[in-house]
């Protein structure tokens, strides 16, 4: 079975950082030349003489960890025999992904006219690891001009409630900007747009007469 070499580095290491090394011995005592095979992301280079492996591009845990490549050790001179080992680079997470909406929320709506202030629930996520506990996002409006019409309140670490502050909304689309902060180190913030449609309803769903063209929705902020 192939020998497996492992190394562990933070995904934000500087380009040119030594991330590991592989060593091989030739029974006849000949020099060995090292090369990489399967570096599909172009992240690594190997010193042909020493077997030291360096990063040559930004690493990204979210693209996949561990990152697996093969190291080929070849005799210099002689019969040029070679052997292949596995090198597994385990990438440790850095908080480098801003929060985002957990799914496509293009279908959010309220039945028009509102008889009382209403609310809806949305969910946030990100692509970073959350060891020992789940994500703890905080939610706030993206502009003070929204405060007269909307209120956002946290339900838990991943979910929040968007509520209307009055019932005077027209039958049209409004886009509500929401800031989501992950509270990480460093804290990252994402600004997301929640499109909310106020529409005439039939049996609890938006009613769109056949052939009705809504035109370009106006952004409400």
């Amino acid at each position: 079975s192939q020998h497996v070499f492992q190394a562990k580095v933070s995904e934000d290491v500087a380009i040119g950082t030594k991330v590991g090394n592989v060593t091989a011995k030739d029974p006849e005592g000949l020099d060995i030349s090292y090369s990489l095979r399967g570096d599909t992301r172009g992240w690594l280079k190997i010193d042909h003489v020493t077997g030291e492996i360096f990063s040559v591009a930004p690493l990204d845990r979210e693209a996949g960890s561990p990152y697996r490549v093969q190291v080929v050790a070849t005799e210099v001179g002689g019969s040029s025999l070679s052997s292949v080992s596995e090198f597994h680079l385990i990438l440790m997470d850095v908080n480098d992904n801003p929060p985002r909406l957990a799914k496509d929320y293009t279908g959010l709506f309220f039945c028009h006219p509102l008889s009382a202030p209403g609310s809806l629930i949305f969910e946030a996520t990100d692509d970073d690891q959350h060891l020992f506990r789940g994500p703890h996002f905080t939610f706030s409006l993206g502009s003070g001009s929204l405060q007269n019409d909307w209120e956002v309140s946290k339900i838990n670490g991943t979910h929040a409630r968007l509520s209307t502050r009055h019932t005077e909304f027209e039958e049209r689309e409004y886009v509500v900007l929401i800031r989501i902060n992950d509270g990480g180190r460093p804290p990252l913030e994402g600004i997301v747009s929640l499109p909310v449609t106020f529409c005439s309803c039939v049996e609890g769903s938006c009613f769109r007469p056949a052939g009705h063209q809504t035109g370009i929705p106006t952004v409400g902020m």
Epitope: H166, E170, T218, M221
Partner: antibody, heavy 115, light 108 residues
Framework: QVQLVQSGAEVKKPGASVKVSCKAS????????MHWVKQAPGQRLEWIGE????????NYNQKFKGKATLTVDKSASTAYMELSSLRSEDTAVYYC????????WGQGTTVTVSS | EIVLTQSPGTLSLSPGERATLSCSVS???????LHWYQQKPGQAPRLLIY???NRASGIPDRFSGSGSGTDFTLTISRLEPEDFAVYYC?????????FGQGTRLEIK
């Protein structure tokens, strides 16, 4: 009741900076964003930007990016607007305002830029 | 940015008359995002009407607002001497928030 009390008039030389303050009372300071508005002599009102006092996140009118910097001191319930590299066109009355409820404005601070 | 154009620039009327002030918006906005302010010399703007048609606290019922889309109107049914001032419309639909250039209401 809500009160926004601004600092006094300032006279500055071109190239200087000025920092206008807006002391808020009568409500929880971190609850509502603070807005700043410019009114040059005989001109329409111009929105400069807004700041969320809870975390100092700010949105600026593109026209005032690099000119105005909005900050807050939560412990003093005070918002600040600093104007840099002053020119004669910056001569104006500057207002802080709570857009929440639309109706609460400071009394205005006159900034005069003159050599 | 959304541009608000007010007309007329100056309106000369007598006390007791009816005043109609217009605000044209460069892009359609929701009624909930159009507001009117009154400003007198040396004073901060004072909120008159919010969300197109709601009178602010303490504003007499001679002031009313209407409109939708791109055309909005402030009406003062019977002018009182204290109503002569500059009136601004303002939109809160898009950043940056913008104001009209103002209509000066003066005594004829």
């Amino acid at each position: 009741q809500v009160q926004l009390v601004q600092s006094g008039a300032e006279v500055k030389k071109p190239g200087a900076s000025v920092k206008v303050s807006c002391k808020a009372s009568g409500y929880t300071f971190t609850t509502y964003w603070m807005h700043w508005v410019k009114q040059a002599p005989g001109q329409r009102l111009e929105w400069i930007g807004e700041i969320d006092p809870s975390d100092s996140y700010a949105n600026y009118n593109q026209k005032f990016k690099g000119k105005a910097t909005l900050t807050v001191d939560k412990s003093a319930s005070t918002a600040y607007m600093e104007l840099s590299s002053l020119r004669s066109e910056d001569t104006a009355v500057y207002y802080c305002a709570l857009y929440y409820g639309y109706g609460d404005w400071g009394q205005g601070t006159t900034v005069t830029v003159s050599s | 940015e959304i541009v608000l154009t007010q007309s007329p620039g100056t309106l000369s009327l007598s006390p007791g008359e009816r005043a109609t002030l217009s605000c044209s918006v460069s892009a359609s906005i929701s009624r909930i995002h159009l507001h009117w302010y009154q400003q007198k010399p040396g004073q901060a703007p004072r909120l008159l009407i919010y969300r197109t048609r709601n009178r602010a606290s303490g504003i007499p019922d001679r002031f009313s607002g209407s409109g939708s889309g791109t055309d909005f109107t402030l009406t003062i049914s019977r002018l009182e001497p204290e109503d002569f001032a500059v009136y601004y419309c303002q939109q809160g639909s898009n950043l940056p928030l913008t104001f009209g250039q103002g209509t000066r209401l003066e005594i004829k």
